[in-house]
Amino acid sequence: LVPHLGDREKRDSVCPQGKYIHPQNNSICCTKCHKGTYLYNDCPGPGQDTDCRECESGSFTASENHLRHCLSCSKCRKEMGQVEISSCTVDRDTVCGCRKNQYRHYWSENLFQCFNCSLCLNGTVHLSCQEKQNTVCTCHAGFFLRENECVSCSNCKKSLECTKLCLPQIENVKGTEDSGTT
């Protein structure tokens, strides 16, 4: 079975790599525009130059193309704690990231928020903080992990998951209460 191709892909596949089929004349293959430029006018005929123009400030194309417009540069989302790692150029989009000692949490494929790396107070670092993952902490005895922080077992209620980890402490507290009521 032949995979389904979109109209643009069908048209491009007729021409050799680096060229595209003229939209008005399918016997002509025009040279694609270099990255950093966009298509202003198709080539007038075989072997003639495509009219490519450089992207204006605030826009870019990152690969060879026959786009009629450059793509708008992304803006880093301050409200998500993002900072600009490198600014947009005609051939590369803005690169956004997080500050030192922060990691990215992706809420969706194209949306991330910066959060502070956990310090593992009352625990030890099992895995260091990475670009896209928080520190993994292991808690000391008498503490359990809640929202990636080591919390005292005295804050563990019986209904919570922590009861397994804090069972000896909970039993101790119960035992002390029992002995006080005799």
């Epitope: 989302r77 301050k78 409200e79 949490h105 809420w107 928020q113 959060f115 928080n134 929202e147």
Partner: nanobody
């Protein structure tokens, strides 16, 4: 005490519209980025849209772009989500929430309002 109360959900036919509201209290609304998230039956939470303090910076998930509009009225401490051209896949409980600060979980979100898109 932070309180977020959503309203405006209901049953609507495909292609129809709804406007969700979220009344906020217990914090300085005008200083906070606000978020709409949703949870479809048997699925996890999905980030739908957010809006910054001034209402200038907005974000939309690809699945709702061009159909949903987020807005806010800081004088009324209210967040809105205008939903047009609704589809069956938009069926979910919609929650308004404060942008998380400490980590990737929602410390403050409302009880939700159910949106059902069906003919």
């Amino acid at each position: 005490e932070v309180q977020l109360l959503e309203s405006g959900g209901g049953l609507v036919q495909p292609g129809g519209s709804l406007r969700l509201s979220c009344a906020a209290s217990g914090f300085t609304f005008k200083n906070k980025t606000m978020v709409w998230v949703r949870q479809a039956p048997g699925k996890g939470l999905e980030w739908v849209s957010h809006i910054d303090q001034e209402g200038e910076g907005t974000y939309y998930a690809d699945s709702v772009k061009g159909r949903f509009t987020i807005s806010r009225d800081n004088s009324k401490n209210t967040l809105y989500l205008q939903m047009n051209s609704l589809r069956a896949e938009d069926t979910a409980v919609y929650y308004c929430a404060l942008l998380p600060k400490r980590g990737p979980w929602f410390d403050y979100r409302g009880q939700g309002t159910l949106v059902t898109v069906s003919s």
